[in-house]
Interface confidence: low
């Protein structure tokens, strides 16, 4: 199990990097930060450390409620500061292992 | 290397409503913000919208006129306004807002609409 | 709205000279959203400066940009025959995003 969930935090990690290049990845992302209302990886401040990716701003799939720019410049009281591979890692334990 | 295409007709007359296409060869509209833009004879650059995988934004200048939507499997997005005016006869943008530079990075090469009777 | 206004309107120099655009916002822009675009005849504007300071690729270092909060500014440090053009500044920080009204940099 912890293996799993070691494999799935590096594996999340390593689409946030390919996600201001690949589509296809960006749409899996958004997906999963949406459904789980969950935005990076420990918490949303891994996006500013993806390069490419400026300091202020993260993924849409990221805010609460979808503004006007809400990924740009956005405001921490707008968007989900709770990571993504604890949040679906609770749900994959709880489900799936 | 994304390229984007404006279509549309070139004429549209005053009330009717102007309707413009974007085709994005080279990359998917589903990520990256998607904008309209505009460059009335003589004048300067006028930002209309975007759309990002279906939310969107408008200037709200034209905001009760404007509506910016997108077709994923036509890789496609589009422009519509409504109630026009000799005011809209414009050079008609649109553009990519690219998560590299966070500004608009990739242009089409401009269509004119005139409005006129 | 934010207000970009640009200064001057129209720039004569001849090639080989400096060209200082500044470009003033009504109020204080976040500067990684600050940007820079060259506009020839007929042409698409193609973006030279983002995030005030940053080149966008394919653009060489004789075009830098500079600023931070009102006040913001394009240099080109020695001009070339392809540089005669219009230049936008363009903040996209804060909806609506705005555009400058142009400096046109002409031939004297």
């Known amino acids: 199990r912890d293996k799993v969930m070691s494999e799935f935090n590096n594996n999340f990690r390593q689409q946030m990097e390919n996600y201001p290049k690949n589509n296809h990845t960006a749409s899996i992302l958004d997906r999963m930060q949406a459904d789980f209302k969950c935005c990076g990886a420990a918490n949303y401040t891994d996006w500013e450390k993806i390069p490419s990716m400026s300091k202020n701003r993260v993924p849409d799939s990221c805010c609460i409620n979808v503004t006007v720019g809400c990924g740009i410049n956005f405001n921490e009281k707008a968007i989900h500061k709770e990571g993504c591979v604890e949040k679906i890692g609770g749900w994959l334990r709880k489900n799936v292992l | 290397q994304v390229q984007l295409q404006e279509s549309g007709p070139k004429v549209v007359k005053p009330s009717e409503t102007l309707s413009l296409t974007c085709t994005v060869s080279?990359?998917?509209?589903?990520?990256?913000?998607w904008n309209w833009i505009r460059q009335s004879p003589g004048k300067g650059l006028e930002w209309i919208g975007y759309?990002?995988?279906?939310?969107?934004d408008y200037n709200p200048s034209l905001r009760s006129r404007v509506t910016i939507s997108e077709d994923t499997s036509k890789n496609q997005f589009s422009l519509r306004i409504s109630s026009v005016t000799a005011a809209d006869t414009a050079v008609y943008y649109c553009?990519?807002?690219?998560?590299?530079?966070?500004?608009?990075?990739?242009w089409g090469q401009g269509t004119m609409v005139a409005v006129s009777s | 709205e934010i207000v970009l206004t640009q200064s001057p309107g129209t720039l004569s120099l001849s090639p080989g000279e400096r060209a200082t655009l500044s470009c003033r916002a009504s109020?204080?822009?976040?500067?990684?959203?600050l940007a820079w675009y060259q506009q020839k005849p007929g042409q698409a504007p193609r973006l030279l400066i983002y995030?005030?300071?940053s080149r966008a690729t394919g653009i060489p270092d004789r075009c830098s940009g500079s600023g931070s909060g009102t006040d913001f500014t394009l240099t080109i440090s020695r001009l070339e025959p392809e540089d005669f053009a219009v230049y936008y500044c363009?903040?996209?920080?804060?909806?609506?995003?705005?555009f400058g009204q142009g400096t046109k940099v002409e031939i004297k």
């Open positions: 553009a990519q807002m690219g998560w590299g530079s966070h500004a608009f990075d990739m």
């Open positions: 995030g005030a300071s």
């Open positions: 759309t990002k995988r279906g939310y969107t």
């Open positions: 363009q903040q996209y920080g804060s909806s609506p995003w705005t």
């Open positions: 080279g990359g998917s509209i589903s990520s990256y913000y």
């Open positions: 109020q204080s822009v976040n500067s990684r959203y």
